[in-house]
Amino acid sequence: IWELKKDVYVVELDWYPDAPGEMVVLTCDTPEEDGITWTLDQSSEVLGSGKTLTIQVKEFGDAGQYTCHKGGEVLSHSLLLLHKKEDGIWSTDILKDQKEPKNKTFLRCEAKNYSGRFTCWWLTTISTDLTFSVKSSRGSSDPQGVTCGAATLSAERVRGDNKEYEYSVECQEDSACPAAEESLPIEVMVDAVHKLKYENYTSSFFIRDIIKPDPPKNLQLKPLKNSRQVEVSWEYPDTWSTPHSYFSLTFCVQVQGKSKREKKDRVFTDKTSATVICRKNASISVRAQDRYYSSSWSEWASVPCS
Amino acid sequence: RNLPVATPDPGMFPCLHHSQNLLRAVSNMLQKARQTLEFYPCTSEEIDHEDITKDKTSTVEACLPLELTKNESCLNSRETSFITNGSCLASRKTSFMMALCLSSIYEDLKMYQVEFKTMNAKLLMDPKRQIFLDQNMLAVIDELMQALNFNSETVPQKSSLEEPDFYKTKIKLCILLHAFRIRAVTIDRVMSYLNAS
């Protein structure tokens, strides 16, 4: 058993049918010695008396808010949560496996630049009685500071019969140098509590591996005289690291017809302009990627050929 | 990256072309190592990230763009010098171009070159003959060093009398390649910045 926060405790259970469970001793936080009784949750049934209460915790029915009283007055509370270990593996019931980039990916994180700021998100089908707490650091043995905000519900989607809820959090490394070569990964730890179930999820990454630039901005077309060709121009996104001559991007320019089946013409360039043939009803899209370290491409920025 | 690559202009900052080739070569070598050594811990998540140049060179600090010198987090051990003597700088004058930066890059290359050559000698003794260092990568390191044209004492190649542990050697190769790729990215960024200056 360990303390998650004041008066909230996590009991780790080897989870299998007929398991013996864990013996837990609760102590009433009071100078009083006599006339103390214990109850669980809203029930008025007295579970025991005395300053300490010994219980055998086996299932969720044994978890909950234990309260010690004296003469009708509440003295203190202890909330017991359960953390299930199923055949050596901690349970992952609360969050959905996003399966990208690999199986057992519960947390996904992205950064728009090298400033040390990043966003993580996760999915669940649970809509109520759900709380998250996020901590992060650079490295784990001698951790350096990363500050995370509160996790918030960022999107709701319908997937078949189920509703899916996306939560996200923003974090910022306390003293980040954009040019630094990372040797210790960022660690992100999410504590999830659903009713009386506790779970924790972790992700470990280098900022360089989760970079996804914003799409190029100010995408413009300039027709070339007496030609079907157009000059496409764009700019680096405002959120990208500076100076741009050091943090350079490379770009992919795509001409896409109205039909998805039509052949796509693609050009790769390090410049912020390109000359392409503009077909009728086609659109021109441009996306960006770090020129030197191949992390994710940005989303497309698009303009119609007309 | 398997994309069309534009060839640099002849008047371009001479080292940029070499540094681009270096990054391409080390990235290809790392990809090959990860495929060939698929049953070894060779991915970024699995290896220990060691930097053989740590405390010996200060490339990141010495080559920091002027715009980032205002960022206190980047100024841990920054020493600045604006005197230059490398041939890459022959045709450019700019306050950013520091001898310290380019000599630090040169020292990095020299250290990795020695490590890679020593490692290759061990890998050639492996009866499995599973993986060797790409000669192109070694040649590209050499070309960039020549372009930098710094005179420095030659480091003797390490020789070992004991029987090499090939498993450990292959893991060390992965660690070295990951670290060298990260340094090659920094070198490319620096050369791109200098080219624009």
Epitope: D14, Y16, P17, D87 | -
Partner: antibody
Framework: QVQLVQSGGGVVQPGRSLRLSCAAS????????MHWVRQAPGKGLEWVAF????????YYADSVKGRFTISRDNSKNTLYLQMKSLRAEDTAVYYC????????WGQGTMVTVSS | SYVLTQPPSVSGTPGQRVTISCSGG????????VKWYQQLPGTAPKLLIY???QRPSGVPDRFSGSKSGTSASLAITGVQAEDEADYYC????????????FGTGTKVTVL
């Protein structure tokens, strides 16, 4: 004590279907994940499928994916394995087992796929 | 479909020490715990070892398990006639929750 009683096995022709059941007692069935494991005559153990305690996630071995469906009815304390498009190589003793460090096994039920 | 490799058979005389190896990879034994089962003819497998080296109550202490890297082993110190059975190791595949992987099985013969 924990008990898993299996039923539904038998002889079936290739291409046909069969549904196995596993009735659980002696524990809170709705709190635990469950597996199906099979053993072909004279061969080793092969994992077939897993279902989470609440039925929300199901996982299958490649050899049965798209043909077998694991399901559970927590109100009836019963686990099922619906087997379609059966092949000769599906002939085996099928076991249901609880998920956990100490697992409990059913007595097994024989499925024979033969023309 | 067997991911974990065991020797097909091992034998020993009563009182001898018998060991069975189980070889896997980084995604199974390398990152998950190992179990061992004993199966007597015509019966369901019985759990002998869980969590690499833990014995459930009721299992004689002559059975012991260990794990190192991507391999595991079961030792029977002072093998007895009633230990003649098939033995299977089992782990999980890290890439897929709930996906149990079994060993090829080892027949233990007491001479």
């Amino acid at each position: 004590q924990v008990q898993l009683v299996q039923s539904g096995g038998g002889v079936v022709q290739p291409g046909r279907s069969l549904r196995l059941s596993c009735a659980a007692s002696g524990f809170t069935f709705s709190s635990y994940g469950m597996h199906w494991v099979r053993q072909a005559p004279g061969k080793g153990l092969e994992w077939v499928a897993f279902i989470r305690y609440d039925g929300s996630n199901k996982y299958y071995a490649d050899s049965v994916k798209g043909r077998f469906t694991i399901s559970r009815d927590n109100s009836k304390n019963t686990l099922y394995l619906q087997m379609k498009s059966l092949r000769a190589e599906d002939t085996a003793v099928y076991y249901c087992t609880t998920h956990g460090s100490h697992d409990n096994w059913g007595q097994g039920t024989m499925v024979t796929v033969s023309s | 479909s067997y991911v974990l490799t065991q020797p097909p058979s091992v034998s020993g005389t009563p009182g001898q020490r018998v060991t069975i190896s189980c070889s896997g990879g980084r995604s199974n034994i390398g990152s998950n715990t190992v179990k061992w089962y004993q199966q007597l003819p015509g019966t369901a497998p019985k759990l002998l070892i869980y969590g690499n080296d833990q014995r459930p109550s009721g299992v004689p202490d002559r059975f012991s398990g260990s794990k190192s890297g991507t391999s595991a082993s079961l030792a029977i110190t002072g093998v007895q006639a009633e230990d003649e059975a098939d033995y299977y190791c089992q782990s999980y595949d890290s890439s897929l929750r709930g996906s149990r992987v079994f060993g090829t099985g080892t027949k233990v013969t007491v001479l």
